[in-house]
Interface confidence: medium
C-alpha cells in the first residue's frame, strides 16, 4: 500500500510506504499503522527542528529519524545526532546550520526500530520552511510635521525577507496593516499628533529566496505620540 500525503507549506507530496504483513486474523499488524507526520521548520537558517507527535503511537515508541539530500553528489543517509524528547520518548530531531542545505530537496525518513518495515519518507523543500527571528531594533523618526518613518533590523539576509507592519492608535478597534518588501522601512504619511501610535512588525522568508508561508513572531511594539489612555474607551479592550 503506497499512500500519498499532501503536506502543507508548498512542499512536494510526501510518499509514505506502509507495509502489509501476512496476517492470520482480521486484525492489522503493527507494521500497517501509519507513522506520525514529520514537520520541519528552519529557524533563521541557524538550526532546524523536525518534530512528530510521539503521543500518536499506540504505545511509547522511540522512533528514529534518518535524512539525506536528493540529487546530492553525496546523498549518504545521515542518522539524527540530536534527538528531541517528550516525556523521555523521541519526538523530534534538531539539525545544525552546517547540516542544512536550503536549496536541495530534503528527504526525511521516520522509522520504528522495533518494526523496521514500518517507515515513512517525506520530501521537503527547506527554503519554504524558514521562519526568521522577529524583527529587532524598531526605531521611529519624524520626516515632517505629519510623517513618520519606521525602521527595523533583521538578524538575517535582508533581501530574503518581506515584512508586515501593523499599527494602530489608542482609539482604533483594530490594527491597520501594510506589506513591505525587503527594504525594511515603512512611512506613515499622515500622523495625528493628538494620538498615541503603536507599531509592530513581523517578517517572512519570501519571495526572493524561498516561498515560506510562516511569519516570524511579532517584534516588540514601539510607540509614538501622547498617551491618551485616560480619555480612550477602547484602550483596555485592545490591550487584552
Amino acid at each position: 500500500l503506497n499512500t500519498t500525503i499532501l503536506t502543507p507549506n508548498g512542499n512536494e507530496d510526501a510518499t509514505t510506504d506502509f507495509f502489509l504483513t501476512s496476517m492470520p486474523t482480521d486484525s492489522l499488524s503493527v507494521s500497517t499503522l501509519p507513522l506520525p507526520e514529520v514537520q520541519c521548520f528552519v529557524f533563521n537558517v541557524e538550526y532546524m527542528n523536525c518534530t512528530w507527535n510521539s503521543s500518536s503511537e499506540p504505545q511509547p515508541t522511540n522512533l528514529t529519524l534518518h535524512y539525506w539530500y536528493k540529487n546530492s553528489d553525496n546523498d549518504k543517509v545521515q542518522k539524527c545526532s540530536h534527538y528531541l524528547f517528550s516525556e523521555e520518548i523521541t519526538s523530534g530531531c534538531q539539525l545544525q546550520k552546517k547540516e542544512i542545505h536550503l536549496y536541495q530537496t530534503f528527504v526525511v525518513q521516520l522509522q520504528d526500530p522495533r518494526e523496521p518495515r514500518r517507515q515513512a519518507t517525506q520530501m521537503l523543500k527547506l527554503q519554504n520552511l524558514v521562519i526568521p527571528w522577529a524583527p529587532e531594533n524598531l526605531t521611529l523618526r519624524k520626516l515632517s510635521e505629519s510623517q513618520l518613518e519606521l525602521n527595523w533590523n533583521n538578524r538575517f539576509l535582508n533581501h530574503c525577507l518581506e515584512h508586515l507592519v501593523q499599527y494602530r492608535t489608542d482609539w482604533d478597534h483594530s490594527w491597520t496593516e501594510q506589506s513591505v518588501d525587503y527594504r525594511h522601512k515603512f512611512s506613515l504619511p499622515s500622523v495625528d499628533g493628538q494620538k498615541r501610535y503603536t507599531f509592530r512588525v513581523r517578517s517572512r522568508f519570501n519571495p526572493l529566496c524561498g516561498s515560506a508561508q510562516h511569519w516570524s513572531e511579532w517584534s516588540h511594539p514601539i510607540h509614538w505620540g501622547s498617551n491618551s489612555s485616560k480619555e480612550n474607551p477602547f484602550l483596555f479592550a485592545l490591550e487584552a
Epitope: V45, S72, D73, N74, K97, I100, L102, Q104, L157, C209
Partner: nanobody, 118 residues
C-alpha cells in the same frame, strides 16, 4: 563586498547550448559556495545548481539534472554553468550568487537573460 558579474546569456534555439559565467573580478569569491538561480517572468526565483569551493559538493535541481553542468576554475574566481539541450521553459534571467554556506547566499549578481526559442 563581493561583486558578482554574470555573462554568456543570449538567444538560442531549443536543443542548443549556452555557457554562463560568473566572475568575481580581481579576487576570489571569498565564500564557500557559489550557486546559480533563475527567475522566469511572473515566477519566483528558483535554485538551479551550486558548487562548493572544494568542488566536492555539487547540487542540481531536478529540472536541469543531466542537462546542466556547474564547474569552477582553480582560482575560485569563476564558476561556469554549461547548459545543454535547452528547452523553452529554461527561458529566464539567470543569477549568480555566493554565500558562506549551502543555506544562505549573501551576494548576488545583476543577472543575465537566457531566451530559448522554439
Amino acid at each position: 563586498q563581493v561583486q558578482l558579474v554574470e555573462s554568456g546569456g543570449g538567444l538560442v534555439q531549443a536543443g542548443g547550448s549556452l555557457t554562463l559565467s560568473c566572475a568575481a573580478p580581481g579576487r576570489t569569491f571569498g565564500t564557500d559556495v557559489v550557486g546559480w538561480f533563475r527567475q522566469a517572468p511572473g515566477k519566483e526565483r528558483e535554485f538551479v545548481a551550486s558548487i562548493s569551493r572544494s568542488g566536492d559538493g555539487i547540487y542540481y535541481d531536478d529540472s536541469v539534472k543531466g542537462r546542466f553542468t556547474i564547474s569552477r576554475n582553480n582560482a575560485w574566481n569563476t564558476v561556469n554553468l554549461q547548459m545543454n539541450s535547452l528547452k523553452v521553459e529554461d527561458t529566464a534571467v539567470y543569477y549568480c550568487a555566493a554565500g558562506d554556506g549551502w543555506s544562505t547566499y549573501d551576494y548576488w549578481g545583476q543577472g543575465t537573460q537566457v531566451t530559448v526559442s522554439s
